[in-house]
C-alpha cells in the first residue's frame, strides 16, 4: 500500500516520462543574478525559515543549496551588506540528528563551518563572512535559487 506522497511521486514521474524534451533555463530571468550554473534571487523582506522556503517556491525556485566551500565563498561575495543574514535550504533533522538539505541530502561536515548549535528547530543562515545556526523562527532575509543547466527529460515509450 503506497502512501499518498509516494503515489503523488509516482504520478509525477509517469507524467514526466510522457513529456517530450523540456528545455532548461538557459539564462537567468530578469532580477536574478547568475552565479556559475545557478541563478540567485535575494529577498528584500524578512521571514522565518519555513515562510522563506514557501516563498521561493512561488518563484518556481528553492532555497539556496550550497555544494561546497568554494560555492559558499562565491555566494558570500555577492552579499553587499556586512550584518545581514540570509536563510539557505539547510535545517536540522531531529529524527536523523544531522543537518539536512531540502533536497534530502545530508551536510558533508567539511563543507560549512557552522557557528552555533545543531539542535531541534535550528536552520542555517549565511552572512558575508560566516555560516550560522539560528532558530528557524528568526525573521531574516533569504536566497532563492534556480538551476541554469538545461534539463532534458528522456522520452520513454508507454508500457
Amino acid at each position: 500500500q503506497k502512501s499518498s506522497i509516494e503515489k503523488c511521486s509516482v504520478d509525477i514521474q509517469q507524467s514526466r516520462n510522457k513529456t517530450t524534451e523540456r528545455p532548461g533555463l538557459l539564462n537567468c530571468p530578469i532580477y536574478w543574478q547568475q552565479l556559475r550554473e545557478k541563478c540567485l534571487l535575494f529577498s528584500h523582506t524578512v521571514n522565518p525559515w519555513n515562510n522563506s522556503l514557501a516563498d521561493c517556491s512561488t518563484k518556481e525556485s528553492s532555497l539556496l543549496l550550497i555544494r561546497d566551500k568554494d560555492e559558499l565563498i562565491h555566494t558570500q561575495n555577492l552579499i553587499r551588506d556586512k550584518a545581514i543574514l540570509f536563510w539557505i535550504g539547510l535545517n536540522f533533522s531531529l529524527s536523523e540528528k544531522n543537518w539536512k538539505w531540502i533536497n534530502g541530502s545530508f551536510l558533508n561536515s567539511n563543507d560549512l563551518e557552522i557557528r552555533g548549535d545543531a539542535k531541534e528547530n535550528s536552520c542555517i543562515s549565511i552572512s558575508q563572512t560566516s555560516v550560522y545556526s539560528e532558530y528557524c523562527s528568526t525573521e531574516i532575509r533569504w536566497i532563492c535559487q534556480k538551476e541554469l543547466t538545461p534539463v532534458r527529460n528522456k522520452v520513454y515509450p508507454d508500457s
Epitope: I30, Y31, L41, F42, S43, H44, T45, V46, N47, P48, N51, D55, K59, R80, D81, I84, E139, I140, R141, C144
Partner: antibody, heavy 120, light 107 residues
Framework: QVQLVQSGAEVKKPGASVKVSCKAS????????MNWVRQAPGQGLEWMGL????????YYNQKFKDRVTMTRDTSISTAYMELSRLRSDDTAVYYC?????????????WGQGTTVTVSS | DIQLTQSPSFLSASVGDRVTITCRAS??????VVWYQQKPGKAPKLLID???IRHSGVPSRFSGSGSGTEFTLTISSLQPEDFATYYC?????????FGGGTKLEIK
C-alpha cells in the same frame, strides 16, 4: 484600489514618543511588506525600516534602531511606526510605503503622509 | 552607505521640451534604481523600477536608462502635470538611499 491612509498630524515635545498608523485597503495586507520613509522640511527622503505584516518580522535602518518600533494589527490591516526620544530634527512628514515585491526594493504605493512636529 | 547625487538640483523647462535628469551612485548598484515623482504636499509616486521598467499606468514619455553608477530619467515631451520634484532611489544594498531630488519648474 490600493489605499494607505495614515493618522493625522502630531505635535510633540522633545523626549516624547509618537505613534503613526497606516491603514491598508484594496489588497491583502499580509501579502506585502510595509516600509516607513520620512521627509524633513525641504529635504530628501530617508528610509527608516520595514515590517512584514504576515510574520511581524522587522528590519530597521541602523540610524533609528534604538528609537523605532514597527508593529502591525492584521485584524484591522494597519501598520504602526513608533519613534521615541523625539528631537527637533525628527520634525518631518512620515510616510508608510508598500514594498512592491518581496525581491525588489521599490515602493509602489504610499500613504498621504503624517506631519510630526517636535517643538518645545 | 551608497550616496546618490542628482543633477541638476533645479531645472527650468517649457511644455513640450525634452528633459533629462541624472542620478550618480557612489558605488556600482547594478540596475537596482527607482525613480519617483513628487508634487508639493503629496506622497512620491513610482515611475520606474530596475532602472528602465515603467510602472503600470506611467505615460510612455517617461523613460529610464543606465546601469552601474550612472542613471538617467528622460521626459520626452514635457506636459503641464510633469512639473514636480523627481527622486532616484537605490536598493542594491539593504540600506535604501535616495537622491537629493531634482525640482522641475516651468520656465
Amino acid at each position: 484600489q490600493v489605499q494607505l491612509v495614515q493618522s493625522g498630524a502630531e505635535v510633540k515635545k522633545p523626549g516624547a514618543s509618537v505613534k503613526v498608523s497606516c491603514k491598508a485597503s484594496g489588497y491583502t495586507f499580509t501579502g506585502y511588506t510595509m516600509n516607513w520613509v520620512r521627509q524633513a522640511p525641504g529635504q530628501g527622503l530617508e528610509w527608516m525600516g520595514l515590517i512584514n505584516p504576515s510574520s511581524g518580522g522587522t528590519y530597521y535602518n541602523q540610524k533609528f534602531k534604538d528609537r523605532v518600533t514597527m508593529t502591525r494589527d492584521t485584524s484591522i490591516s494597519t501598520a504602526y511606526m513608533e519613534l521615541s526620544r523625539l528631537r527637533s530634527d525628527d520634525t518631518a512628514v512620515y510616510y508608510c510605503a508598500r514594498l512592491g515585491d518581496n525581491y525588489r526594493g521599490y515602493f509602489d504605493y504610499w500613504g498621504q503622509g503624517t506631519t510630526v512636529t517636535v517643538s518645545s | 552607505d551608497i550616496q546618490l547625487t542628482q543633477s541638476p538640483s533645479f531645472l527650468s523647462a517649457s511644455v513640450g521640451d525634452r528633459v533629462t535628469i541624472t542620478c550618480r551612485a557612489s558605488q556600482d548598484v547594478g540596475s537596482a534604481v527607482v525613480w519617483y515623482q513628487q508634487k508639493p504636499g503629496k506622497a512620491p509616486k513610482l515611475l520606474i523600477d530596475w532602472a528602465s521598467i515603467r510602472h503600470s499606468g506611467v505615460p510612455s514619455r517617461f523613460s529610464g536608462s543606465g546601469s552601474g553608477t550612472e542613471f538617467t530619467l528622460t521626459i520626452s515631451s514635457l506636459q503641464p502635470e510633469d512639473f514636480a520634484t523627481y527622486y532616484c532611489q537605490q536598493y542594491s544594498t539593504y540600506l535604501y538611499t535616495f537622491g537629493g531630488g531634482t525640482k522641475l519648474e516651468i520656465k
